[in-house]
Amino acid sequence: APVPPGEDSKDVAAPHRQPLTSSERIDKQIRYILDGISALRKETCNKSNMCESSKEALAENNLNLPKMAEKDGCFQSGFNEETCLVKIITGLLEFEVYLEYLQNRFESSEEQARAVQMSTKVLIQFLQKKAKNLDAITTPDPTTNASLLTKLQAQNQWLQDMTTHLILRSFKEFLQSSLRALRQM
């Protein structure tokens, strides 16, 4: 697993370097998670032919994965910093149950899956410190999450692999959109 942000050898070797700003730390954290997702996607794609699945088939899924929409204020047109930040944090909180589902799903990248999960928790904390309107952030219901996780794990093998592929793809897209939006803040 890659070394988490702020723990690489360059940081140790350069004690006089300016500490990272909050925005830089968030940027670095997202890029670190995206690297982790790439490694997980690599294993998934090597294991099965899921990655060749058509966009149409993937669109017809029973999941309710977070997705950026125009109304969320994260796109260049109609950009709204506060609305967007709330959407990013809410979306990441909603992704947590899906990241839990990914645990124990990887043979050679087991540590990587755990790192993505833990780094996302840290990213949420960073972003919550940045947000002014924490009351607008809705936390998913733990009971609903528990039954969703049970339902996902009950699926047949092919469906589980499709679900894994879709979660990774959607999480990557969500993080990329978030990264672009956060760089405008």
Epitope: S53, E56, A57, L58, E60, N61, N62, Q103, N104, R105, F106, E107, K151, Q153, A154, Q155, N156, Q157, W158, L159, Q160, M162
Partner: antibody, heavy 121, light 111 residues
Framework: EVKLEESGGGLVQPGGSMKLSCAAS????????MDWVRQSPDKGLEWVAE??????????YYTKSVRGRFTISRDDSKSSVYLQMNNLGAEDTGIYYC????????????WGQGTTLTVSS | DIVLTQSPASLAVSLGQRATISCRAS??????????MNWFQQKPGQPPKLLIY???NQGSGVPARFSGSGSGTDFSLNIHPMEEDDTAMYFC?????????FGGGTKLEIK
């Protein structure tokens, strides 16, 4: 050629135990999920238990009526799946089939011939 | 759990005619554009034999007179033309998720 062969059935008294075995051949067993399905005259076909391959968690699933009494296990080195049945009742009487769900679609494409369990005093 | 209601419980069809068996699921068995509904034929003293998988695909070596259709919660198995060898029990089964469930069965006979 895929083959599934069950063994271990017979007559057992209520409250007793029995262990069924299923020997598989003709496919990569360690990658496969394996299931037990039973059939009784009054209940028709009923799925009993499933054991999954590594990287799928939880690894075992059971139908409600057998949970806590039955245990499904596997030995990849022997290409075998087992069903340990404890505290048996008359309602467990039936033909027990070992079956394999196909990766694409999860349908049971191969079945063993079945082994009969009779629970009676 | 997904409950499968199969109808009719028994059916008598003349040789050469069409037999239609229905299966209704208590919730959708669809996902990713696929329907996880399967059909089995069973003759006395034999294990079930796969006829149709994922709603409309024929199992290996299954004659073309067997066809399946449907999506979501409503499915059907069609046998046309009916042959003597088709006298058997027929079951629908969902393979979307555990607990995998079966319909109660349809006994098909020749009229």
């Amino acid at each position: 050629e895929v083959k599934l062969e069950e063994s271990g059935g017979g007559l057992v008294q209520p409250g007793g135990s029995m262990k069924l075995s299923c020997a598989a051949s003709g496919f990569t067993f360690s990658d496969a999920w394996m299931d037990w399905v039973r059939q009784s005259p009054d209940k028709g076909l009923e799925w009993v238990a499933e054991i999954r391959s590594k990287t799928y968690h939880p690894a075992t699933y059971y139908t409600k009526s057998v949970r806590g009494r039955f245990t499904i296990s596997r030995d990849d080195s022997k290409s075998s799946v087992y069903l340990q049945m404890n505290n048996l009742g008359a309602e467990d009487t039936g033909i027990y089939y070992c079956t394999r769900p196909r990766y694409y679609g999860g349908y049971f494409d191969y079945w063993g011939q079945g082994t009969t369990l009779t629970v009676s005093s | 759990d997904i409950v499968l209601t199969q109808s009719p419980a028994s059916l008598a069809v003349s040789l050469g005619q069409r037999a239609t068996i229905s299966c209704r699921a208590s919730e959708s068995v669809d996902n990713y554009g696929m329907s996880f509904m399967n059909w089995f034929q069973q003759k006395p003293g034999q294990p079930p034999k796969l006829l149709i998988y994922t709603a409309s695909n024929q199992g290996s070596g299954v004659p073309a007179r067997f066809s399946g259709s449907g999506s979501g919660t409503d499915f059907s198995l069609n046998i046309h033309p009916m042959e003597e060898d088709d006298t058997a029990m027929y079951f629908c089964q969902q393979s979307k998720e555990v607990p995998y469930t079966f319909g109660g069965g349809t006994k098909l006979e020749i009229k």
